[in-house]
Amino acid sequence: FVRTKIDTTENLLNTEVHSSPAQRWSMQVPPEVSAEAGDAAVLPCTFTHPHRHYDGPLTAIWRAGEPYAGPQVFRCAAARGSELCQTALSLHGRFRLLGNPRRNDLSLRVERLALADDRRYFCRVEFAGDVHDRYESRHGVRLHVTAAPRIVNISVLPSPAHAFRALCTAEGEPPPALAWSGPALGNSLAAVRSPREGHGHLVTAELPALTHDGRYTCTAANSLGRSEASVYLFRFHGASGAST
C-alpha cells in the first residue's frame, strides 16, 4: 500500500504555473464491462496525476481479484520519453495494452474470454525517475463474462439399497436452469444445487432415484442458449452402464 512522497517541491510548484488547475491522482474505470466467453473485452482505465509533463520511466500494471495484493495479469514498462510500453507480463498471452500510458490511458484488451476471467481487475501506474510516485484503482472494473450453457459432467452413481442416482453439472452465465427428462419422469427440475462459493458458474441437478431403465437427458438453458446430454441406465444383474 505504499505511496511514495513526491521528491521535490520544485516539481510541485511548477505544476501550478499554468493556467489550468493542477490535477491530483485519480483513476476512472467503469464499474462493470460485459462480454461473452470466447470474445474479447476492453477494460477502460484512465488516470490523472499531479506531475505535469512527466516523461520519465513508467510501468503500467493490471492485477486481478484484489487491489494492491492480487496477482498481476499484465505489466509493461516505458522508457524515459518513449510512448512504447514494452510488455513484460501477459498472462497466457491474452492481455494487451490498448491505451497509451503517456496519455494517461491504461486501457487493456483481454482476448479469448473464459468464465474464469469473470472477476475484478485493477489498473496501476508507477512513475520512477526524477519523480517516484504510484497510484492504483481501488474499486476496479468488474469483468462480467457471459456464456451459453455447457454440460461439464453427467453421470449415474450407485446409492443405498441397490438404487441409482444421476448427477448433471453445467456451467454458464447466467447460471443455467437444469431439467431432467427420462422414463416416467416427464420434465423434472429435480434437486438443483445452487452455485457454490467459488464455483459461481456451476450448477448441479440430481435425480435421487432412478426407477426405470432407459435414457435420462439433462438439459441446461439460459438466455444465451441451451445444451443437453444423456446417460443410459441398464440394470443387468445389478450392474449399471452409462454413456453420454
Partner: antibody, heavy 116, light 109 residues
Framework: QVQLQESGPGLVNPSGTLSLSCTVS???????YSWVRQPPGKGLEWIGE???????NHNPSLKSRVTMSVGKSTSQLSLILNSVTAADTAVYHC???????????WGPGTMVTVSS | SSELTQDPAVSVALGQTVRITCQGD??????ASWYQRKPGQAPILVMY???NRPSGIPDRFSGSNSRNTASLTITGAQAEDEADYYC???????????FGGGTKLTVLG
Amino acid sequence: QVQLQESGPGLVNPSGTLSLSCTVSGDSIRNWYSWVRQPPGKGLEWIGEIHDNGGTNHNPSLKSRVTMSVGKSTSQLSLILNSVTAADTAVYHCAREGLPDGLDIWGPGTMVTVSS
Amino acid sequence: SSELTQDPAVSVALGQTVRITCQGDSLRSYYASWYQRKPGQAPILVMYGQNNRPSGIPDRFSGSNSRNTASLTITGAQAEDEADYYCGSRDTSDYRVLFGGGTKLTVLG
C-alpha cells in the same frame, strides 16, 4: 439501499479487548470499508480499512492492536482492538468507500466506553 | 507532515457564502473529501474528488483545490448547514486516511 449498523459491548475493561461488528444490509459486501472513531469532544480518527477480498490497510498508530476481518456470507465486518485504555473511548463507525476516496455510507455508530 | 489543518470555527450569515479550508501536503497529490457531521448523527459525505457531489447533496455545496489547500464553499448558507465539517485525504507515504481536526460552522440569523 445500503445500510450499515455497528454493534458492540458498550463497556470494556481497561487492558481488555474491544470487539465490534458491522452488518451490511441492502447489498453484498463489495469494495472497501473503513472503521472510524470519534472520541468525546474530539475529531474523527481513521482506524483502518478492509477490502471485500480481505486486504487491509491500517492507521500505523493503531496497527499493532487492530485486527479487521470480513465475512461475506454473513454480510458482516468485524473490528478487534486489543489492550484498550480510556483513550479508546469513542463512538465507532463503519463506513463504505463507495466513491473514489469518499466514505459515502456510514453506520450510525456505537458508543464504547473503556472503564472499570 | 502527515496532517490536515482546518480552522476550528467559522460563522456565516444566513444566505451568505462561506468557505471552509483544509491545508496539508497530501492535498498536492490527492483530492480531499468533505464530511458534514451534526450532533448525534453519522457523518455525511458532501464532496469528493475534483468537485463532485454525491446524489442528494444540494448544489450550494462546491469544492476546489489549489496547491496544498482544498476548499468547501457553501453558497447561500442555510440554517440546516450548521454542523461540523471535516476534510479527509490520503497520506502520500502510507496511504492511510487523514482527517482534519474539523471546522464548526455556525449559521447566524
